[in-house]
């Protein structure tokens, strides 16, 4: 193999910090999996840098990542999903830094979607429902969800509820009357697969009813 950088380039490169992090998404596009890596230092000069993964692949020994702006990614069916892969930052044939990673331990689920809140007048509660693409997946099916909600005026005062289903009931008496609330949800692998929180779903906004003066209950 060939393709070495100039010596000066390598000497400069060795002064930099090439720490990176990666996450995998399984069956993210039909049966295709993806692997995304990025440098932790956003100021790294990535001009001649490439990422390569070797080992725990089905059809080839190594694969090169594709570069899009400052992220590097692979989308393929060819991850074995058993054992560790070696992911390296390379200049030509020289490896600047490498990590041995089991792709099943860096899974980032897709964000939940279709979040909605319905008020049930008779029950005096709010039913929160959302959807996740993972219900249809072969691999990462079991997730823990984190539902976070806040009164719109309380910028950093989020209340979090963890659940394994896609339905949650919020009691009316636990919420402020006549208030606007924001709610959102994210997911993390919860069985066999390990990894990171998904992105948050788009927020949903709902208003709680006013208190009915005669009964002390919300309208």
């Amino acid at each position: 193999e060939s393709g070495y950088a100039q010596n000066g380039d390598l000497e400069d490169a060795e002064l930099d910090d090439y720490s990176f992090s990666c996450y995998s998404q399984l069956e993210v596009n039909g049966s295709q999996h993806s692997l995304t890596c990025a440098f932790e230092d956003p100021d790294v000069n990535t001009t001649n840098l490439e990422f390569e993964i070797c080992g725990a692949l089905v059809e080839v020994k190594c694969l090169n990542f594709r570069k899009l702006q400052e992220i590097y990614f692979i989308e393929t069916k060819k991850f074995l999903l058993i054992g560790k892969s070696n992911i390296c930052v390379k200049v030509g044939e020289k490896s600047l830094t490498c990590k041995k990673i089991d792709l099943t331990t860096i899974v980032k689920p897709e964000a939940p979607f279709d979040l909605s809140v319905i008020y049930r007048e008779g029950a005096n509660d709010f039913v929160v429902t959302f959807n996740t693409s993972h219900l249809q997946k072969k691999y990462v099916k079991v997730l823990m969800h984190d539902v976070a909600y806040r009164q719109e005026k309380d910028e950093n005062k989020w209340t979090h509820v963890n659940l394994s289903s896609t339905k949650l009931t919020l009691l009316q008496r636990k919420l402020q009357p006549a208030a606007m609330y924001e709610i959102k949800v994210r997911s993390i692998p919860d069985h066999y697969f390990k990894g990171f929180w998904s992105e948050w779903s788009p927020s949903y906004y709902f208003r709680t009813p006013e208190i009915n003066n005669s009964s002390g209950e919300m309208d």
């Epitope: 393709g3 694969l63 090169n64 393929t76 030509g92």
Partner: antibody, heavy 122, light 107 residues
Framework: QVQLVESGGGLVKPGGSLRLSCAVS????????MAWIRQAPGKGLEWVST????????YYPDSVKGRFTISRDNAKNSLYLQMNSLRAEDTAVYYC???????????????WGQGTLVTVSS | EIVMTQSPATLSVSPGERATLSCRTS??????LAWYQQKPGQAPRLLIY???SLHIGIPARFSGSGSGTEFTLTISSLQSEDFAVYYC?????????FGGGTKVEIK
């Protein structure tokens, strides 16, 4: 449609140099690894070189390493093979080939040029 | 370096018969194997990749099997246009390598 057209072949003396070109059309060259593969008269296929989609990595067998250099100019939709210190055993039809899969490096080839003949003889 | 061995070197078959071509590798290449057909004066044509996936436009009478180090290309019922040279190629690792070829000729 996808087309690969090689040029630059010819008769050269042992020790001489030649530069092959491959003009591509019908696809985005920068998305693909590209390769040169050769076939000596009456013989089988022999892989000569591969270049990654970015052009940052190149690969050669021992038989040509240090003598041949693969390069690409995505803006000109062209792939090149610079051949130095040519030997009689380099005589072959040289094919430019594109892998079926874009990116990453799955090197099986679904598009081939028609080939250009390189003859090394005194 | 992975060494590719194809057998037989020549296979004599009558039209309509089944042809079985073999390809062995010196190391485990999982399913990183392709098959090509080449006719005189033409460039090779991809038939099979991933050891058993039929390339688009290739007739279903062609099939590939095997994994690890032993692979087979089968032509279920030879047509006149199938008489050609067939090559296997490993793309599991560099250096990429082709087998020596099997010539399928009319019996």
């Amino acid at each position: 449609q996808v087309q690969l057209v090689e040029s630059g072949g010819g008769l050269v003396k042992p020790g001489g140099s030649l530069r092959l070109s491959c003009a591509v059309s019908g696809f985005t060259l920068s998305d693909y690894y590209m390769a040169w593969i050769r076939q000596a008269p009456g013989k089988g296929l022999e892989w000569v070189s591969t270049i990654s989609a970015s052009g940052l990595r190149t690969y050669y067998p021992d038989s040509v390493k240090g003598r041949f250099t693969i390069s690409r100019d995505n803006a000109k939709n062209s792939l090149y093979l610079q051949m130095n210190s040519l030997r009689a055993e380099d005589t072959a039809v040289y094919y430019c080939a594109r892998p079926m899969s874009a990116h990453y490096g799955f090197n099986y080839f679904d598009y081939w040029g028609q080939g250009t003949l390189v003859t090394v003889s005194s | 370096e992975i060494v590719m061995t194809q057998s037989p070197a020549t296979l004599s078959v009558s039209p309509g018969e089944r042809a079985t071509l073999s390809c062995r590798t010196s190391e485990d290449i999982y399913n990183g194997l392709a098959w090509y057909q080449q006719k005189p004066g033409q460039a090779p044509r991809l038939l099979i990749y991933s050891a058993n996936s039929l390339h688009i436009g290739i007739p279903a009478r062609f099939s590939g099997s095997g994994s690890g180090t032993e692979f087979t290309l089968t032509i279920s019922s030879l047509q006149s246009e199938d008489f050609a040279v067939y090559y296997c190629q490993q793309y599991y690792d560099y250096p990429l390598a082709f087998g020596g070829g099997t010539k399928v000729e009319i019996k």
